[in-house]
């Protein structure tokens, strides 16, 4: 799943995985 | 706030190992997808590879250039990113950067293959 | 492997003016999900990139709004409404839709 960028209650930072494709399957050769 | 500190570069023959390590700080390291991202002087960037968190079985990707050869990992206990590499090329020469799925960037880490 | 064409390889740009850079895949970056990956970064001169934008058109965290992305499917473009002088360095558009993750080769921008 991804996650978005945010604060917690603990201070920490949530990194933001909302770049990249969740189930990534290789490029097709063209 | 957010650091990513990358240690374990420094010079290696041709064929030999380092490992790197990632350590993350101020960020919820386990829901992190992590990679690392290398550049040769003056070059532009390559992805080398990710490994994904718990809930995405950590699953790992390579690039086709060091598959077989480089092994990325994480120890969410240490907050930390690993990437084993093995059978070094000349061509591996560069400054390695690990980084929250592109999210959050540390400042890297040069590594040099030379004889 | 995705081939990522950026251009102009070099901008040179008057403080307070736009700035406009394109970027073109050469396959769709369309996932499944209907969400486009692609993410704009910036390396300023002596340090490590920083992302701006993702998916296309989100900035962000603590981005100023003078950038802005756009497009679809496999042409984008990355726009600064006015450059300021920290705005320097190389523009790098990368794809996150197949692996493997590929990167633009940079488009440097410099102060007139």
């Known amino acids: 799943s991804e996650t978005t960028t945010g604060t917690s209650s603990n201070s920490s930072q949530s990194t933001s995985n909302s770049g990249l494709a969740p189930n990534p399957t290789n490029a097709t050769t063209k | 706030e957010v650091q990513f500190v990358e240690s374990g570069g420094g010079l290696v023959q041709p064929g030999g190992s380092l490992k790197l390590s990632c350590a993350a700080s101020?960020?919820?390291?386990?829901?992190?997808?992590m990679d690392w991202v290398r550049q040769a002087s003056g070059k532009g960037l390559e992805w080398v590879a990710e490994?994904?968190?718990?809930?995405?079985?950590?699953?790992?990707y390579y690039a086709e250039s060091v598959k077989g050869r480089f092994t990325i990992s994480r120890d969410d206990s240490k907050s930390t990113a690993y990437l084993q590499m093995n059978s070094l090329k000349t061509e591996d020469t560069a400054i390695y950067y690990c980084?929250?799925?592109?999210?959050?960037w540390g400042q890297g880490t040069l590594v040099t293959v030379s004889s | 492997d995705i081939v990522m064409t950026q251009t102009p390889l070099s901008l040179s740009v008057t403080i307070g003016q736009p700035a406009s850079i394109s970027c073109k895949s050469s396959?769709?970056?369309?996932?499944?999900?209907?969400?486009?990956?692609l993410n704009w970064l910036l390396q300023k001169p002596g340090q490590s990139p920083k992302r701006l934008i993702y998916q296309v058109s989100k900035l962000d965290p603590g981005i100023p709004d003078r950038f802005s992305g756009s497009g679809s499917e496999t042409d984008f473009t990355l726009k600064i409404s006015r450059v300021e002088a920290e705005d320097v360095g190389i523009y790098y558009c990368m794809q996150g839709s197949s692996l493997p993750w590929t990167f633009g080769g940079g488009t440097k921008v410099e102060i007139k």
């Open positions: 101020g960020v919820t390291f386990s829901e992190a997808w």
């Open positions: 980084t929250g799925a592109m999210d959050y």
């Open positions: 490994i994904r968190d718990k809930p995405n079985s950590y699953v790992t």
């Open positions: 396959q769709s970056l369309l996932y499944s999900n209907g969400k486009t990956y």
